[in-house]
Amino acid sequence: KSSNEATNITPKHNMKAFLDELKAENIKKFLYNFTQIPHLAGTEQNFQLAKQIQSQWKEFGLDSVELAHYDVLLSYPNKTHPNYISIINEDGNEIFNTSLFEPPPPGYENVSDIVPPFSAFSPQGMPEGDLVYVNYARTEDFFKLERDMKINCSGKIVIARYGKVFRGNKVKNAQLAGAKGVILYSDPADYFAPGVKSYPDGWNLPGGGVQRGNILNLNGAGDPLTPGYPANEYAYRRGIAEAVGLPSIPVHPIGYYDAQKLLEKMGGSAPPDSSWRGSLKVPYNVGPGFTGNFSTQKVKMHIHSTNEVTRIYNVIGTLRGAVEPDRYVILGGHRDSWVFGGIDPQSGAAVVHEIVRSFGTLKKEGWRPRRTILFASWDAEEFGLLGSTEWAEENSRLLQERGVAYINADSSIEGNYTLRVDCTPLMYSLVHNLTKELKSPDEGFEGKSLYESWTKKSPSPEFSGMPRISKLGSGNDFEVFFQRLGIASGRARYTKNWETNKFSGYPLYHSVYETYELVEKFYDPMFKYHLTVAQVRGGMVFELANSIVLPFDCRDYAVVLRKYADKIYSISMKHPQEMKTYSVSFDSLFSAVKNFTEIASKFSERLQDFDKSNPIVLRMMNDQLMFLERAFIDPLGLPDRPFYRHVIYAPSSHNKYAGESFPGIYDALFDIESKVDPSKAWGEVKRQIYVAAFTVQAAAETLSEVA
């Protein structure tokens, strides 16, 4: 139903009024304001920004705006003992050192408190040894090295290029391979788009630019010292040896000028194939060690960073619902940045700020949403999604009973080509319907809908005439809401053309060059893409908070469940003999999916026909919709990942950024041919099929008639 049927709404106060109030010029102004100094988590500057946002959200008209603080484990370089990597000769003399900081961008030379590039949560250490080049340090890269090339990384320092997968997975893989240190670098093949100049003359990464980032493997735990519980004043903290997800070997990031000096001397094995070669003028030899003339030289890391329990601050704003105040729609994005945060996160925070302002304007005119809207400015996202996770841990009982939806609002742009959406299938129809009502900002699509330009530029691989919508993975603040609590979630941003730009993310990601000027000069001078993202994010929140019947379509879940069941079955069928030997059957899963499909169809029919003027029946139907996502949660979690509890989706065990479907079954099948005990391994596959089938069936039954 359209939003303007909600209670206490005059025709003036509909979605159009909300959308018309959003202004590109305001987003631009807010972005400038948020990006003039660094806002690193745990610093005074970021606390001051939290207080500023609190004050402004109050001025905008929210009912209440509070700071929620937690004391969590963060990581910082030692100010007097910098981190660097050396090439040392046989006498131990340092003949080359990597850079201590990035050359500052023009106009920012005198800015203080720019944290130098570092890998957050790296342990201290000064390992020295031979180098091994491990490509992207993916699972398959180590398989190639160890199984095909018979190269042993044990006791070696590995050098890996950034890209393809989350850096924490790279470090985990290197640890498992026995490495004693990891060097991460940005290769121009992945972070320098052909035909574009380096910053400040374009949006490419200069040779001195370096990507910061955490290297944790938290698997949804939040603060490493207080997994499962909020890091509050009376928290019991684990010892550092028992902390969740910390790396055990030193790690440090470098730019491609420094990487050139390390890689140009590499000897040993040649790269196995062209997919291991980047764009530097080096041989990309795998090693181990340097070539003939330089064989006595070694690499030495000098890492002195410290882990410190530090106070962080979330800003939580509330706009109370007029009809269902105990139903929460949440819009959240982080505030902390590695340096200036020109894209990550402030392009998102500026959009949230303008959405709050627009909602506040409507509220000041007497309007209220049907349901409560919560707005969040999260802290310490860059250190492992800590602010959002701690808040959700503290409020988990309320959220699991009252949480309708969570819309994430990190970077609004990672390109300016087309829309990119990742969300629960429950939101597919909401996103489709909304984007059909919005104007496309794209050149060549004047007067056309956003849906049309998006579908043309990013078509669905399965359904013609529809746009691609991806699975939710992780690496952002929706994680705890979706993967742990089972609250329907979604995210939207403008992205690049993935077909023509093969680099990973955007080139200046997490570098000092992510400035206001980067956005204003090169990505979105008119802020029209930011405005479109504000309309999508804000429009989703508006509909979720205001429509009489929740805008979720359970039939779309049925469709994807069948697709995911087919996919996992075909993976398993690569081992037909073992499936026969161990009596592995997917019948229960396909039966459950069939039941889900039939029950969802009947539920949708009832949804069309029920008496919407009966508040009890309306609430009952809406609760069935709200709790459907919750029904996919297994309270026991996935094997060895207790905080990833969603049975249909989890972050990939090989790449935190990517979503995996039926992750329990997928992980049980992964590399099963190499397992020492096939009987046990296939037994686990059968158990995971059972868990998945049961969960899908149980979820289906939540949509059945209640009596």
Partner: nanobody, 123 residues
Framework: EVQLVESGGGVVQPGRSLRLSCAAS????????MNWVRQAPGKGLDWVAF????????YYADSVKGRFTISKDNSKNTLYLQMNSLRAEDTAVYYC????????????????WGQGTMVTVSS
């Protein structure tokens, strides 16, 4: 206007010390590698020393290694060359020169030169 101005040259006895300065204007020293180059009377140019933009790498010609020290003060936008144990063969015009590339890790092509300062080592 982008320019480099050297100072601190003069006549000095062998074995003594001298400190050259190079004041940069029109660009931030913090972003560029810097070099000292010298030209002895009637000879060609000789590279003397390099310091990376961040100070992490310093390289010296073999002839001055252990005697000369290159440094810079980013807050003053000034490059220095501390010359100890001076010898007659150090007599030359000393030029400071800016690396062409932001963030270069080793000496690259030089795009801005100073006018030079004369150092004479003589008893």
């Amino acid at each position: 206007e982008v320019q480099l101005v050297e100072s601190g040259g003069g006549v000095v006895q062998p074995g003594r010390s001298l400190r050259l300065s190079c004041a940069a204007s029109g660009f931030p020293l913090i972003s560029y590698g810097m070099n000292w180059v010298r030209q002895a009377p009637g000879k060609g140019l000789d590279w003397v020393a390099f310091i990376s933009y961040d100070g992490s790498n310093k390289y010296y010609a073999d002839s001055v290694k252990g005697r000369f020290t290159i440094s810079k003060d980013n807050s003053k936008n000034t490059l220095y060359l501390q010359m100890n144990s001076l010898r007659a063969e150090d007599t030359a015009v000393y030029y400071c020169a800016k690396d062409r590339i932001v963030g270069a890790r080793v000496p690259d092509a030089f795009d801005i030169w100073g006018q030079g300062t004369m150092v004479t080592v003589s008893s």
